[in-house]
Interface confidence: medium
């Protein structure tokens, strides 16, 4: 079942719960981190634990089997079921934002395509809870800076609607 850290607002679904493939990653992050990069997967959304677990597996399978990465690229994935799904977690360098940004940031990705709509309130709360959790655990600096994926790479991610939304979050800083 989900692990609930007392400092976290959102439960985090551990890898074994969503039946992740074993990670082959070895590069550790140097905590606490100064940056968070928000993206979207641009694929299917999900709104139940069962469908979100499946979607997390789909993303991981694509990243590992098609792209040849050591694991799913994101540190965490956010489902519209209001749950956070553990990707590479707080300790391992992701593959979400390019060579410069990956080692200095946590990549969180909303499962779905948010060009034309915003995520559910539950998903937004889950993401915000995760960030609060990161600060409380010492994984993120208290003055961390939030970026949209398109702020650091040439991409449409995290989608127009989600991008506009995160620009109003307190830690967001425009490029």
């Amino acid at each position: 079942q989900e692990t609930e850290d007392p400092a976290c607002c959102s439960p985090i679904v551990p890898r074994n719960e969503w039946k992740a493939l074993a990670s082959e990653c070895a590069q550790h992050l140097s905590l606490p981190l100064r940056y968070v990069v928000v993206s979207h997967t641009a694929g299917s959304s999900c709104n139940t634990p069962a469908s979100c677990q499946q979607q997390a597996r789909n993303v991981q399978h694509y990243h590992m089997k098609t792209l040849g990465w050591c694991d799913v690229g994101y540190n965490f994935l956010i489902g519209e079921d209001g749950l956070v799904y553990e990707g590479r977690g707080w300790n391992f360098t992701g593959a979400h934002s390019g060579h410069l940004w990956n080692p200095m940031s946590i990549g969180i990705s909303f499962m779905g395509n948010y060009m034309d709509r915003v995520p559910t309130p539950q998903a937004i709360r889950a993401a915000q809870g995760l960030l609060a959790c990161g600060v409380a655990q010492g994984a993120l600096r208290s003055n961390y800076v939030l970026k949209g994926h398109r702020d650091v790479q040439r991409t449409l991610s995290p989608g127009n609607q989600l991008y506009h939304l995160i620009q109003n979050w307190p830690h967001y800083r425009s490029p």
Partner: antibody, heavy 119, light 107 residues
Amino acid sequence: QVQLQQPGAELVRPGASVKLSCKASGYSFTSYWMNWVKQRPGQGLEWIGMIHPSDSETRLNQKFKDKATLTVDKSSSTAYMQLSSPTSEDSAVYYCARDYSDYDGFAYWGQGTLVTVSA
Amino acid sequence: DIVMTQSPATLSVTPGDRVSLSCRASQSISDYLHWYQQKSHESPRLLIKYASQSISGIPSRFSGSGSGSDFTLSINSVEPEDVGVYYCQNGHSFPLTFGTGTKLELK
């Protein structure tokens, strides 16, 4: 508007360390990385390193790890770079520079300090 | 370290010319490439960020293109005040590195 003020010149004896200053104004000093760039006379630009004034996190070009020490004084919004055991190779103009936002180009530059190492 | 090579080393132009300055990275850097202009006895000035994004206050005659390892800074109608040295900068990975520079001069 963003301003980075540096002294025009410093004369230093070989082996005697020198501490260069860069006073920032017109923005929140603790919110942006401060970079240092070296330019030898008639030569190109070399990135020395950067420091985040909020907590003094530093990223240094390994080439300068035994040469440059970066510090800040938040109370005066001033960044410093100390050069240890200077030689003639350290004679150069040293610029402080601030990113536009984060890692997206040095949009704001000081006027540079000309360091001359001479006996 | 990523090595940035610029060509030509010197470019002699006539006002009104359209010129292209080249920058090549020793490995792919996507579009993490910034361009600067440095006039004699002045600090560098940021012209273009992320290969092609314009900077507020920079004349529209300056434009950038390219991705991967090959990049170009174009000046579509050179003005006399454009003389100086132009540098590209790797913003892809540490250490941040600058190109060797292209000196733009008038014929």
